[in-house]
Amino acid sequence: HTAAQDNCTCPTNKMTVCSPDGPGGRCQCRALGSGMAVDCSTLTSKCLLLKARMSAPKNARTLVRPSEHALVDNDGLYDPDCDPEGRFKARQCNQTSVCWCVNSVGVRRTDKGDLSLRCDELVRTHHILIDLRHRPTAGAFNHSDLDAELRRLFRERYRLHPKFVAAVHYEQPTIQIELRQNTSQKAAGDVDIGDAAYYFERDIKGESLFQGRGGLDLRVRGEPLQVERTLIYYLDEIPPKFSMKRLTA
């Protein structure tokens, strides 16, 4: 992410190296880890970002109750296999030939198996629930102000179409952001809710993926919104397939 010619940098992804060697001699930015060219006018796919991260030197309530099929990313970081478009391949394997199936946000949705494990398709995560707890404040935030600020954030910072922010719930100190995006709704050029959620997660953790921008400074009517805990639930278009042993554990 350093080449100087014509400000050859990637504003939306600092985990890149840019060089004026693209088509027509234009600036081209390659994701670390994979070397795949990325479109710096939009968010980079989560798969390429995870791969880059792994290659980097070693770094009557209104609240929604997640459904029984909701997945939480308990497995943490891994070095994923991405397809030619930068999406997660349906089957992921580690160096010891342990394999598992993932959804479109790269979260495991089956028990782990061996190389014979089949993952017929990449199952789409169509509903993401971002569950936040904010630090204590003098008083509760105004719900409509909070709603407007978070919608603005997803629209302006992450370029996510407003129709994909389904709802913002608030019960002090818990905030929930619901993102919904079915396969049929996602048009060419639309930011994926999984990518937007990942950028948001990294922002909240103070690990912004944006080049040269300051960290996330969330304010509601001038009052800082500081998050102290984040949980993200992923709901797939097809429920995950785990053995009963895991479900009862």
Partner: antibody, heavy 115, light 107 residues
Amino acid sequence: QVQLQQSGAELVRPGTSVKMSCKAAGYTFTNYWIDWVKQRPGHGLEWIGNIFPGGFYTNYNEKFKGKATLTADTSSSTAYMQLSSLTSEDSAIYYCARGGVFDYWGQGTTLTVSS
Amino acid sequence: DILLTQSPAILSVSPGERVSFSCRASQSIGTSIHWYQQRTNGSPRLLIKYASESISGIPSRFSGSGSGTDFTLSINSVESEDIADYYCQQSNSWPYTFGGGTKLEIK
């Protein structure tokens, strides 16, 4: 004009190491990748890896991890490749090229590993 | 890794003929393919970049086409100086890979 000048031929013993150089001129060294390619006599071209001098990022073909080490000195616009634990299989011509499109190539360094 | 398969291994043509070299990728790589010529005892030379972009100083008889997985390098009127090995290379993702090459011979 852009030029990549490689160091001269090397004759070395098995088990030793060698470090070859690639001096760039005619462009901003820190703006482009330098890639290294191996060619054994009668064989095709094999990508070893690359280095981005602007940030010292490196990538290696899995086959050459532990064999090749890529470095760069921005003050002299020179890229280096060290090959270790040499065997006869390492005897080849080694090229440096400006990447990611290899639009300029060095003249090659011939490495002969022989006892 | 992306596998590039070049065919045929050897092409034998008469001067003035049109010749085409094929390069097939094991997965879609857009237009991230480049073509090189290597004469005997010489370094490779870039002929075409990004599947079809011409290179300054390369004769106009060289052209390229294709996208996705199938790519072609063409010489519309072969000259004796074109005797060489021809390689395709992908820069879609690391590790970069080369095709096995096609040797052009003149009848």
